[in-house]
């Protein structure tokens, strides 16, 4: 194989659908890693800085999009209440096993070394409250109290 085909993934995190939250009181975050080659990746979910395994469903293997491109998806399911807390932080991390420091790499593009690529999101209050305004509200309430 031509080592120049080695490519790290682009990682995207998709927020839960309003329909799922309304109908099932559950919230599924979807992580998508695309465009990587070869298919040497490990995907993990982190909530509030800690790795989680409960509620996680990851594709059993990467799907071949084209000759030199794979994709992998994973889902994290949490309660709607948990998702609606804007202080909760969600991160999907993909470790891509690329080239080592010893591997040669030609001029013209960055060397795709082993690396971690992440996508993240904060929980969303269902009335348009942001993390900042939520924390400001908590601070105000504490002062008033």
């Amino acid at each position: 194989e031509d080592l120049r085909n080695v490519t790290p993934p682009k990682v995207s995190l998709f927020e839960p659908s309003k329909a799922e939250i309304a109908n099932k009181q559950k919230a599924t975050l979807v992580c998508l890693a695309r465009g990587f080659f070869p298919d040497h990746v490990e995907l993990s979910w982190w909530v509030n800085g800690k790795e989680v395994h409960s509620g996680v469903s990851t594709d059993p293997q990467a799907y071949k999009e084209s000759n030199y491109s794979y994709c992998l998806s994973s889902r994290l399911r949490v309660s709607a209440t948990f998702w609606h807390n804007p202080r909760n932080h969600f991160r999907c991390q993909v470790q891509f096993h690329g080239l080592s420091e010893e591997d040669k790499w030609p001029e013209g593009s960055p060397k795709p070394v082993t690396q971690n690529i992440s996508a993240e999101a904060w929980g969303r209050a269902d009335c348009g409250i942001t993390s900042a305004s939520y924390q400001q509200g908590v601070l105000s309430a504490t002062i008033l109290y």
Epitope: R4, K104, G108
Partner: antibody
Framework: EVYLVESGGDLVQPGSSLKVSCAAS????????MYWVRQAPGKGLEWVGR??????????EYADSVRGRFTISRDDSRNSIYLQMNRLRVDDTAIYYC???????????WGQGTMVTVSS | YELIQPSSASVTVGETVKITCSGD??????AYWFQQKSDKNILLLIY???KRPSGIPERFSGSTSGTTATLTISGAQPEDEAAYYC???????????FGSGTQLTVLR
């Protein structure tokens, strides 16, 4: 067809400034890192510097002999790179070439060069 | 950092000649080879140690072993009379450096 065309070479005095250009066509310019190479009369090739593309924040690197005096820039909308040369010295006299390198193409096309002469 | 090449080499038409390029970073970084004839045009002959671009005759080949890269011309032709340069990179920034160049004379 890929073309690289350098221009702007001139006869200038030591200590002065000059800006030379390289216009590219026939390929997706923004996908490529671009390079300046020079050749003094009767001498060998010398790497001057490179400018990377936007995914690499247009990072530049320079040879020790020109660092601090020369600046490479690029304009992806014009498919062009530039070499701003300040505090020119007699030993900067050379033909200046541009070339390209990308993920699957490395130094495969070169311009015809533009002559810069620094003399009093 | 330097890439060391012999300043000159000669070969009889139809014979084989090897041009070397030595540098202590060559085990870590790829070598490229270029030809420059008297018209000053620069032509890529070999990239990534041993790959030949389309359109380059098969008589040109490249190899590396340890700290030495080698350009081999098998069955040299009169039109191969030219200067040959190796190129590689070094250091944290992958700065580039050319070899000092080898002037090849093809004897009839």
């Amino acid at each position: 067809e890929v073309y690289l065309v350098e221009s702007g070479g001139d006869l200038v005095q030591p200590g002065s400034s000059l800006k030379v250009s390289c216009a590219a066509s026939g390929f997706t310019f923004s996908d490529f890192w671009m390079y300046w190479v020079r050749q003094a009369p009767g001498k060998g090739l010398e790497w001057v510097g490179r400018i990377k593309n936007i995914p690499n924040n247009y990072a530049t690197e320079y040879a020790d002999s020109v660092r601090g005096r020369f600046t490479i820039s690029r304009d992806d909308s014009r498919n062009s790179i530039y070499l701003q040369m300040n505090r020119l010295r007699v030993d900067d006299t050379a033909i200046y070439y541009c070339t390209r390198a990308g993920r699957f193409d490395h130094f495969d096309y070169w311009g015809q060069g533009t002559m810069v002469t620094v003399s009093s | 950092y330097e890439l060391i090449q012999p300043s000159s080499a000669s070969v009889t038409v139809g014979e084989t000649v090897k041009i070397t390029c030595s540098g202590d970073q060559l085990p870590k970084n790829f070598a490229y080879w270029f030809q420059q004839k008297s018209d000053k045009n620069i032509l890529l002959l070999i990239y990534m140690d041993n790959k030949r671009p389309s359109g380059i005759p098969e008589r040109f080949s490249g190899s590396t072993s340890g700290t030495t890269a080698t350009l081999t011309i098998s069955g040299a032709q009169p039109e191969d009379e030219a200067a040959y340069y190796c190129l590689s990179s070094y250091g944290d920034n992958n700065d580039l450096v050319f070899g000092s160049g080898t002037q090849l004379t093809v004897l009839r």
